[in-house]
Interface confidence: medium
């Protein structure tokens, strides 16, 4: 495996794997047999005084018999070559380690004894230093001997771990939080008889250390890959491990930068913007006038939008946000702006009435236009006789009293609204004064 980057304040070094206790970093792939290690529990027996622990010391000494001049026989022992005493097998194999190889088909373990020579295993059969057909969660006792060591033999207790496929590393991240959090959890997907108190879990994610079955990493960067190595130990011996590289989900896009928004005409507006830095799929543009709200979905490649069919001389509040559809839809912060559309001619006054108040006087009234479309409010009345303008009045309200008209004359009354920028279409009524009653 390649070295992992060193976290701040600490250096991490990956060195070649040694054939001892298993702390390899990744599970083997491509076969049905996986290797896991654990050093076997010791049941150490100390040699008793006077035992045969040193009985081989003189095996290579030769005895010679010589006759002395007196004829008496003298037996002398001459040491030609001596061999150091052999260790006991208990001493020699005190630190023996075991790799547990799991067969997914048979669901049985093979214990591989990590020794340099072919040992004998007493009443257990071992072939090429392997003890076969071990059931998960059951202890097996192996008595190890070899001609290079003396009694007592090494009694090895094989503490067989649970089956590997009974554990599954599960991604427990909530989709709503998957942009900034990672949750990983070891699940027991099948039951086993091993004491769960003897099982410990370790995680290492970057420079974070966890001694839990479930971990939750928070305040992460969106769209980043995080590597977590995990291992499960049985009686403090690792028997399975897994590495997961998890990429955090797309985060909420940033806020678009509005360059400008303004009204180009009475019925039109324009907004231009720069997109946010983070990934996103589309924009939502909403424009609000008074209590009415309209929203549009805009293509991600747009940086300008022309708003049509707007109401003249109206304040529009615009909000623009980007969104991304990831594991869930995430909306970015909205950028806001506002403008007031340009003025336009107002609509026509309505419900205009002309009534005679005396022989030569008229009372003209009307209702305000539906759309003022401008900043000011002024009502105008033009009175024509023939083609001649005889009166031109302006009031704040549409309520005109026209006096001193000619008797028995046809008049045209034109009432219209002026918004300070534009006049509206006039409402026209014809009315005649009567013949004077006096």
């Amino acid at each position: 495996q390649s070295p992992t980057p060193s976290p701040t304040g600490v250096s991490s070094v990956q060195t070649p794997h040694l054939p001892t206790h298993a702390d390899s970093q990744t599970p083997s792939a491509g076969t049905d047999t996986q290797t896991f290690s654990g050093s076997a529990a010791n049941a150490k027996l100390n040699p008793t005084p006077g035992s045969n622990a040193i009985s081989d010391a003189y095996l290579n000494a030769s005895e010679t018999t010589t006759l002395s001049p007196s004829g008496s026989a003298v037996i002398s022992t001459t040491t030609i070559a001596t061999t150091p005493s052999k260790p006991t097998c208990d001493e020699k194999y005190a630190n023996i380690t075991v790799d547990y190889l799991y067969n997914k088909e048979t669901k049985l373990f093979t214990a591989k004894l990590n020794v340099n020579e072919n040992v004998e295993c007493g009443n257990n059969t071992c072939t090429n230093n392997e003890v076969h057909n071990l059931t998960e969660c059951k202890n097996a006792s192996v008595s190890i001997s070899h001609n290079s060591c003396t009694a007592p033999d090494k009694t090895l207790i094989l503490d067989v771990p649970p089956g590997v496929e009974k554990f599954q590393l599960h991604d427990c991240t909530q989709v709503e939080k998957a942009d900034t959090t990672i949750c990983l959890k070891w699940k027991n997907i099948e039951t086993f008889t091993c004491d769960t108190q003897n099982i410990t879990y370790r995680f290492q994610c970057g420079n974070m250390i966890f001694d839990n079955k479930e971990i939750k990493l928070e305040n992460l960067e969106p769209e980043h890959e995080y590597k977590c190595d995990s291992e499960i130990l049985y009686n403090n011996h690792k028997f399975t491990n897994a590495s997961k590289i998890i990429k955090t989900d797309f985060g909420s896009p940033g806020e678009p930068q509005i360059i400008f928004c303004r009204s180009e005409a009475a019925h039109q507006g324009v907004i231009t913007w720069n997109p946010p830095q983070r990934s996103f799929h589309n924009f939502t543009l909403c424009y609000i006038k008074e209590t009415e709200k309209d929203c549009l979905n805009l293509d991600k490649n747009l940086i300008k939008y022309d708003l049509q069919n707007l109401k003249p001389y109206t304040k529009y509040v615009l909000s623009l946000h980007a969104y991304i559809i990831a594991k869930v839809q995430r909306n970015g912060s909205a950028a806001m702006c506002h403008f007031t559309t340009k003025s336009a001619p107002p609509s026509q006054v309505w419900n205009m009435t002309v009534s005679m108040t005396s022989d030569n006087s008229m009372h003209v009234k009307c209702r305000p236009p539906r759309d003022r479309n401008g900043p000011h409010e002024r009502y105008h009345l033009e009175v024509e006789a023939g083609n001649t303008l005889v009166r031109n009045e302006s009031h704040k309200n549409c309520d005109f009293r026209v006096k001193d008209l000619q008797y028995s004359t046809d008049y045209t009354f034109k009432a219209y609204f002026h918004n300070g920028d534009y006049p509206g279409e006039p409402f026209i009524l014809h009315h005649s004064t009567s013949y004077n009653s006096k």
Epitope: P7, G9, V10, S12, V13, Q14, T15, P16, H17, L18, T20, H21, A22, D23, S24, Q25, S39, A41, N42, N95, T97, T200, N207, M208, I209, D211, N236, H237, K238
Partner: antibody
Framework: QVHLVESGGGLVKPGGSLRLSCAAS????????MTWIRQAPGKGLEWVSY????????YYADSVKGRFTISRDNAKNSLFLQMNSLRAEDTAVYYC????????????WGQGTLVTVSS | EIVMTQSPATLSVSPGERATLSCRAS??????LAWSQQKPGQAPRLLIY???TRATGIPARFSGSGSGTEFTLTISSLQSEDFAVYYC?????????FGGGTKVEIK
Amino acid sequence: QVHLVESGGGLVKPGGSLRLSCAASGFTFINYYMTWIRQAPGKGLEWVSYISLSGSTIYYADSVKGRFTISRDNAKNSLFLQMNSLRAEDTAVYYCARRAATVTTFDYWGQGTLVTVSS
Amino acid sequence: EIVMTQSPATLSVSPGERATLSCRASQSVRSNLAWSQQKPGQAPRLLIYGASTRATGIPARFSGSGSGTEFTLTISSLQSEDFAVYYCQQYNNWPLTFGGGTKVEIK
């Protein structure tokens, strides 16, 4: 009972080297992650280095990275710290300690060995 | 690097009294915090791990509390053998870091 005994400390000149040893007994050495921690005279504790069960994963504090090397000999129940390019600020009592079985803190410590770097 | 700050630096207490030691982390270490005791000329001894779990053989008068960034070690009734220096240590992140220590002395 668990017993950790450090050795190899002494007086050395700046730029010199020392090799510390830690002999472990009373527990199955190969089953435990091990560490070195130091304590400058009259000062607090500073973690130095950490080694996994077989030595395949090793960590160093930045202050010693590139100068110190941690290793272990599981057959001999021994932990080592090779210290090169020693500096005055490396003067301290060096403790070897055993990592607890289920958490990354240290449940047993040796008595320490004093390393003095001085010209 | 997570900086561990212990206070006070020195605490003077009479035997039989209660002692409260504080440890603050520069960022959250969850409950991954240990307390150790060191007597002069001796190696440190583990008292508490997981912020509140007593290590094997540690008397019940020692208790730990806290999580995140604020932690407390309480010695309910000080015995003569409790006068020592106490260190907190975080094991949430590499590098592992210790506090500067609190010396508990006889008043």
